[in-house]
Amino acid sequence: IWELKKDVYVVELDWYPDAPGEMVVLTCDTPEEDGITWTLDQSSEVLGSGKTLTIQVKEFGDAGQYTCHKGGEVLSHSLLLLHKKEDGIWSTDILKDQKEPKNKTFLRCEAKNYSGRFTCWWLTTISTDLTFSVKSSRGSSDPQGVTCGAATLSAERVRGDNKEYEYSVECQEDSACPAAEESLPIEVMVDAVHKLKYENYTSSFFIRDIIKPDPPKNLQLKPLKNSRQVEVSWEYPDTWSTPHSYFSLTFCVQVQGKSKREKKDRVFTDKTSATVICRKNASISVRAQDRYYSSSWSEWASVPCS
Amino acid sequence: RNLPVATPDPGMFPCLHHSQNLLRAVSNMLQKARQTLEFYPCTSEEIDHEDITKDKTSTVEACLPLELTKNESCLNSRETSFITNGSCLASRKTSFMMALCLSSIYEDLKMYQVEFKTMNAKLLMDPKRQIFLDQNMLAVIDELMQALNFNSETVPQKSSLEEPDFYKTKIKLCILLHAFRIRAVTIDRVMSYLNAS
């Protein structure tokens, strides 16, 4: 058993049929010695008396808010949560496996630049009685500070018969130099509590590996005289690290119709303009990627050909 | 000494061309190592990230773009210099800061060159003959060093009398390649910045 926060404790349980469970001793936070009784949740049934209560925690029915009273007055609370371990593996029931970039990916993180600011998100099908708490650091043995905000519900989607909820959090490394060469990864830890179930999820990464620039901005087309060719130009996204001559991007320019199966014109360039062949009912799209360290491509910025 | 004309565009900053070749060569070598040593811990997640130049050179700080010198976090505790202007071209005057940056890059290359050559000598003794260093990568390191045109003491190649542990050598190769790739990215960024200056 360990303390998650004040008056909230996590009991780690090996979860299998007829498991013996864990013996837990609760102590009432009071100078009083006599006349103390214990109850669980909203029940008025007295579970025991005395300053300490010893319980055998085996299942979710044994978890919850234990309260010690004296003469009708509440003295203190202890909330017990369960953390299940099945076949030596901690449960991951609360969050959905996003399977990208690999299986067992519950947390996904992205950074728009090298400033040390990043966003992580996760998915769940649970809609109520759900809380998240996020901590982060650079390295684990001698951790350096990363400050994370509160996790918020950022999107709701319908997936077949189920509703899916996306939560996200923004974090900022306290003292980040965009030009630094990372040798210690960022660690992100998410505590998830659903009703009386506790789970924790972690992710470890270098900012350089989670870079995904914003799409190029200000796409413009200029038809070339006596030709089907069009000169398309664009600018670096505002959120990208500066100076741009140091933090350079490379671009992919594509002309394609509505369907992905349609024929296309595609060209890669380090410049902020390119010449392509425009077709009726097609769109010109441009996306960006760090020129020197191949992490993710940005989303496409698009303009119609016509 | 005249710089080798290794770039098709005569106006182009020659070190930029060499640094692009360097990044490409080390990336290819790292990819090859990850594929060949698939049963060794050779991915970014599996290895310890060590920097053999730590406390010996200060490339990131010495080559910091002017715009980032206002960023407290980039100035650390070391004496930091930053790029003002200039290039690798022998005909142009380079500032003191600039020379500091380029000499730091040169020292990095020299240290990695020695490490890679020592390692290759060990790998050539491996009866499995599983992996060797790409000669192209070693040649590209040499070309960039020549283009930087610094003279410095020759670092003797480390020789070891003990029987090499090939497993450890291969893991060290992975560690070294990962670190060198990150440094090659920094070098490329610096050269690109200088080219635009």
Partner: antibody, heavy 118, light 107 residues
Framework: QVQLVQSGAEVKKPGSSVKVSCKAS????????LHWVRQAPGQGLEWMGW????????EYAPKFQGRVTITADESTSTAYMELSSLRSEDTAVYYC???????????WGQGTLVTVSS | DIVMTQSPLSLPVTPGEPASISCRAS??????LHWYQQKPGQAPRQLIY???QSISGVPSRFSGSGSGTDFTLTISSLQPEDFATYYC?????????FGQGTKVEIK
């Protein structure tokens, strides 16, 4: 199986024209760009131009501009390349090639040898 | 027009040995570079697209690398069927242009 089948070899006199055909099978004809590339005996490859069979748009290499015409007939899934004012240096194997991507070629025809000789 | 220069023009190789062919562009073409193989009396066959992207059906011993002006096609271990002429082609701008070809011959 995508295939491009070209017309047979031709012998032409200098100053005349030649029209080579390229019939496509497998896949929808208009879903691909179609190019013509030639290869003189013992020489390298030389791109001549492309057509978008969907709308008839064409683009030619400046070297052949005014002398080459590429057309396509969607009803028969056939593309044509006509080269006029032939000279001896036009003696070459002419290939048609296609792709969903405009600027490179994933499927090639077997080639048509055009000999220009007086 | 962008001029593509291949080297060497002829490459004698022992079967089972690796081979590398270089292709250089007269100006930067990013990764807009493709490789083809041609055997005598046959049409070219696509090997690699956009400098390093492999094609299904092409043996994994063929790999491409490079960007900007310098590109390389590598055959990790030459098989008897690999003796042919190899061409690079740029798609950065029209007109599309090819290298002059590299003939890989049996040593």
């Amino acid at each position: 199986q995508v295939q491009l089948v070209q017309s047979g070899a031709e012998v032409k006199k200098p100053g005349s024209s030649v029209k080579v055909s390229c019939k496509a099978s497998g896949g929808t004809f208009s879903d691909y760009y179609l190019h013509w590339v030639r290869q003189a005996p013992g020489q390298g490859l030389e791109w001549m131009g492309w057509i978008d069979p969907e709308n008839g748009d064409t683009e030619y290499a400046p070297k052949f501009q005014g002398r080459v015409t590429i057309t396509a007939d969607e009803s028969t899934s056939t593309a044509y390349m006509e080269l006029s004012s032939l000279r001896s240096e036009d003696t070459a194997v002419y290939y048609c090639a296609r792709n969903k991507e405009l600027r490179y070629f994933d499927v090639w025809g077997q080639g048509t040898l055009v000999t220009v000789s007086s | 027009d962008i001029v593509m220069t291949q080297s060497p023009l002829s490459l004698p190789v022992t079967p089972g040995e690796p081979a590398s062919i270089s292709c250089r562009a007269s100006q930067s073409i990013s990764i807009n570079l493709h490789w083809y193989q041609q055997k005598p009396g046959q049409a070219p066959r696509q090997l690699i697209y956009f400098a390093s992207q492999s094609i299904s059906g092409v043996p994994s011993r063929f790999s491409g690398s490079g960007s900007g002006t310098d590109f390389t096609l590598t055959i990790s271990s030459l098989q008897p069927e690999d003796f042919a002429t190899y061409y690079c082609q740029q798609s950065n701008s029209f007109p599309l242009t090819f290298g002059q070809g590299t003939k890989v011959e049996i040593k």
